[in-house]
């Protein structure tokens, strides 16, 4: 138990976020770090993972509401299967309809978030930046 | 002592955030929330504060680094002072250099935050969506 | 890369028929395949689509109501459109056509030639 | 299902001239929209993709614009071969829904 050092009383009326890696965003017991150097999707996929997180991965609009304000474009953890046609995130999960808008911009098989729940298909190759995410227990 | 009744263990190589009101991001121990209903600014002001919150203010580049990502305008809580010209923040502290650009984009005495710290001076009654920010203890 | 077209023609109201597309010179079971259908002097019109490789996953137009039906054979590179319970409404040019890459379902970038089918009488 | 409206329906243009035609969306399609030419008995040829990608091999003379739910599609200078049928189609979601097109014709 020597991990354990800090013992909080919280109020009722206020709550506490996370855990979460320190100086991460937390938002409704989701961590999120946004990352400024330019990886592909693969490095930014091995960077997260060196972190215990795994590139965004969008399941929900409304316990994601934070990501409809996001300026610029971004790797998540989205990327296409050539033999169904499907697309899926990192853990296997097909992407649920309606939740990204997937925009036919690049020809690629990785997509980069963009604010209002869209999806714009990239070459996994190219540099961008990229957001990583833990989810808490 | 009523109001508290929670005792968590945190990891020391993690760690919570807040207290924040319940759905609120929270980054470096700060609280945000993004309003999505547009307001003047004093509305905005006013909606904050019954929330035990301020209208957005900027203090520090490197504290506050999630706001360069946010998309859109919104209501901070900065206005214009005519007898001395200077930009000053709801709980009366003046704007430091350096900490926003201010774009004079309308005649007005409030300012809008947009992406990559920038602030737009905006009419204080024109309709526009907000930002709260409670600062932790 | 191309797509061939074959199986349209004169049919009587009532009827039935099956369309189809073969593909060539690109992986065909990692495209989606798309039919659209273009009634003579009119517009464009958008019946569904299906994915060639294993899943064969299929989005259809709102207005098909289960009379036309999309199929595939990943090994013959071939899909094909089957059209039940023919109207003279039906009567028009059908294309198959295929988005510019892989991961693409609503962008065409190759057509095939159009095959004509007629319902009459 | 998302309705797309185009105009004009048709318009008559010279050799040289500048054409704008537009295509309105039910609802935002975020970008979404492609712009195809059909010229009579062919099949359509993709002219331009997410609202202002050119397809390769397309004259730059053609050029696409808009977000939200209004586009447009601009020829700089008609030329001959231009005359021909084009429609607005959204890739935002499925169902797929074209324009009605726009017929331009020799003045």
């Known amino acids: 138990n020597s991990l354990f050092n800090q013992e909080v009383q919280i109020p009722l009326t206020e709550s506490y976020c996370g855990p979460c890696p320190k100086n991460w965003i937390c938002y409704k017991n989701n961590c999120y770090q946004f990352f400024d150097e330019s990886k592909n999707w693969y490095e930014s996929q091995a960077s997260c993972m060196s972190q215990n997180a795994s590139l965004l991965k969008v399941y929900s609009k409304e316990d994601q509401d934070l990501l409809k304000l996001v300026k610029s474009y971004h790797w998540m953890g989205l990327v296409h299967i050539p033999t169904n046609g499907s697309w899926q995130w990192e853990d296997g999960s097909i992407l649920s309809p309606n939740l990204l808008t997937i925009i036919e911009m690049q020809k690629g098989d990785c997509a980069l978030y963009a604010s209002s729940f869209k999806g714009y298909i990239e070459n996994c190759s190219t540099p961008n930046t990229y957001i990583c995410m833990q989810r808490t227990v | 002592n009523s109001l508290f009744n929670q005792e968590v263990q945190i990891p020391l190589t993690e760690s919570y955030c807040g207290p924040c009101p319940k759905n609120w991001i929270c980054y470096k121990n700060n609280c945000y929330q993004f309003f999505d209903e547009s307001k003047n600014w004093y509305e905005s002001q006013a909606s904050c504060m019954s929330q035990n919150a301020s209208l957005l203010k900027v203090y520090s580049k490197e504290d506050q680094d999630l706001l360069k990502l946010v998309k859109s305008y919104h209501w901070m809580g900065l206005v214009h002072i005519p007898t001395n010209g200077s930009w000053q923040w709801e709980d009366g502290s003046i704007l430091s250099p350096n900490l926003l650009t201010i774009i004079e984009m309308q005649k007005g005495d409030c300012a809008l935050y947009a992406s990559s710290f920038k602030g737009y001076i905006e009419n204080c009654s024109t309709p526009n969506t907000y930002i709260c920010m409670q600062r932790t203890v | 890369q191309q797509l061939e077209q074959s199986g349209g023609g004169l049919v009587t109201p009532g009827g039935s028929l099956k369309l189809c597309c073969i593909g060539?010179?690109?992986?065909?079971?990692?495209?989606?395949m798309t039919w659209v259908r273009q009634a003579p002097g009119k517009g464009l019109e958008w019946i569904g689509c299906i994915h060639g490789g294993s899943s064969g996953s299929t989005y259809y137009a709102s207005w098909v109501n289960g009379r036309f039906t999309l199929s595939r054979d990943i090994d013959q590179s071939t899909g094909c459109l089957q059209v039940n319970s023919l109207t003279a409404a039906d009567t028009a040019m059908y294309y198959c056509?295929?988005?510019?890459?892989?991961?693409?379902?609503?962008?065409?970038?190759?057509w095939g030639q159009g095959t004509m089918v007629t319902v009459s009488s | 299902d998302i309705q797309m409206t185009q105009s004009p329906s048709s318009l008559s243009a010279s050799v040289g001239d500048r054409v704008t035609i537009t295509c309105r969306a039910s609802q935002d399609i975020s970008e979404s929209l492609n712009w195809y030419q059909q010229k009579p008995g062919k099949a359509p040829k993709l002219l331009i993709y997410?609202?202002?990608s050119l397809q390769s091999g397309v004259p730059s003379r053609f050029s696409g614009s808009g977000s939200g739910t209004d586009y447009t599609l601009t020829i700089s200078s008609l030329q001959p071969e231009d005359f021909a049928t084009y429609y607005c189609?959204?890739?935002?979601?499925?169902?797929?829904?074209f324009g009605g097109g726009t017929k331009v014709e020799i003045k």
């Open positions: 189609q959204q890739a935002n979601s499925f169902p797929l829904t």
């Open positions: 997410a609202a202002s």
């Open positions: 060539s010179g690109f992986d065909f079971n990692t495209y989606w």
């Open positions: 056509a295929r988005p510019g890459y892989r991961s693409w379902s609503k962008t065409f970038d190759l």
